[in-house]
């Protein structure tokens, strides 16, 4: 149904080996990054914190899908993870490696 | 070509009458809102200011399109416009009505 397909956060586990980042990220082997999936149809729900532009774009798309694309479901808040990584050959621990995991999705 | 279809800002003129907002926005009759269109394929260009999460998601999509959706081309910077509008029956001027026009697009 439309509601089930609406913009929301869904699981996405990243294996660093799979994307070739194990060459510099020593630990962890992977992490739950999540992703934002689903549609942003008008009217845009408040919890998706739409900008005025997103509301207008969604409204234009509703009236004429040729004129404007839909607003897009994207991360609006990201959180850090901790990593052990190689920095110029030095194994370094970083408690907060920013912008790695989605905590909130919204329509933009 | 792929480059021509890459994430960028494109024109989108909004006519307030068309979207029914002429009932409360007195002037202007419309404005250039722009929109963000195009794909966010890996590797994501620097000018599209991708987050680490967007880079990872694009990379996962490249390797397995079933596992993750593409990163999305969205407004990353919005600018205000000036409007004359009705506020409880009073015609009011707002110099900076925020978040109305796209000034930059990026991959998120």
């Amino acid at each position: 149904n439309a509601k089930g397909n609406y913009c929301k956060r869904t699981p996405l586990y990243i294996d660093f080996k799979e994307i070739g980042w194990d060459s510099w990220i020593i630990a962890p082997p992977g992490y739950e990054a999540y992703e934002c999936r689903g549609v942003c149809n008008y009217p845009l729900a408040e919890h998706l914190t739409p900008t005025k532009h997103a509301i207008i774009q969604a409204l234009v798309h509703l009236k004429n899908s040729q004129k404007a694309s839909k607003a897009c479901c994207v991360p609006t808040k990201l959180e850090p993870i901790s990593i052990l990584y190689l920095d110029k050959g030095v194994v370094t621990y970083k408690f907060k490696y920013e912008g790695m995991a989605v905590s909130e999705c919204g329509c933009r | 070509n792929a480059k021509g279809n890459y994430c960028k800002r494109t024109p989108l003129y909004i006519d307030f009458k068309e979207i029914g907002w002429d009932s409360w926005i007195i002037a202007p009759p419309g404005y250039e809102a722009y929109e963000c269109r195009g794909v966010c394929n890996y590797p994501l260009a620097e000018h599209l200011t991708p987050t680490k999460h967007a880079i990872i998601q694009a990379l996962v999509h490249l390797k397995n399109s079933q596992k993750a959706s593409k990163a999305c081309c969205v407004p990353t910077k919005l600018e205000p416009i000036s409007i004359l509008y009705l506020d409880k029956g009073v015609v009011t001027y707002k110099f900076k009505y925020e978040g109305m026009a796209v000034s930059e697009c990026g991959c998120r």
Epitope: Y13, I26, A27, P28, P29, G30, Y31, E32, A33, E79, I81, S82, L84, L86, G89, V90, V91, T92, Y93, F95, M100, A101 | -
Partner: antibody
Framework: QVQLQESGPDLVQPSQTLDITCTVS????????VHWVRQPPGKGLEWMGT???????DYNSAFKDRLAISRDTSKNEVFLKMDSLQTDDTAVYFC?????????WGQGILVTVSS | QFVLIQSDSMSTSAGSTVKLSCKRS????????VYWYQQHEGRSPTTMIY?????PDGVPDRFSGSIDSSSNSASLTINNVQIEDEAVYFC??????????FGGGTKLTVL
Amino acid sequence: QVQLQESGPDLVQPSQTLDITCTVSGFSLTTYNVHWVRQPPGKGLEWMGTMWNGGGIDYNSAFKDRLAISRDTSKNEVFLKMDSLQTDDTAVYFCARLGYYVDYWGQGILVTVSS
Amino acid sequence: QFVLIQSDSMSTSAGSTVKLSCKRSTGNIGSSYVYWYQQHEGRSPTTMIYDGDKRPDGVPDRFSGSIDSSSNSASLTINNVQIEDEAVYFCQSFSSGIKFIFGGGTKLTVL
């Protein structure tokens, strides 16, 4: 305030499985990492594994085949499960919070492996 | 895989300065940060030094960490040693194999 508390059996039979729970309070498991470290009587510290804040798990390869670490973020619990215990697995088992550094430890639980 | 080698025990007198050593068996000591932990008898460890030379809040500035490339060792120096400094001190480092490696510990006795 921040606390970590290990709970589990004091005594385990050889060849049996050890289950320890680390219950945390005062912080989120999605923000901080949790180490499992053990210390045999009169001996040094040995890192066993880490439950990372992003959900990834690392193990000391010395335990990899018989050790499993997991968590329940809603209950603020981290679990250690180790199979096929032998007498030399007798130790104090600690969980510890890793932020910018290891800033909080549980008080430890002494597990004796004996028949 | 490297190991971190610490002397089993050391004695010192109150008020003096003592330097505890942590030698890396293979590879460069500078290729990962060294952390130092203090453990009193029957207690959980506490971090004294992290990222090689940083002190957590509450750790006296009598404690300092350093690296000596010539001996491929990290050192924990304690100035003006106090009775309450009597404890076992463990160094710890990182590797790409066993991610978190502890030294065997040095028991410091204050006379």
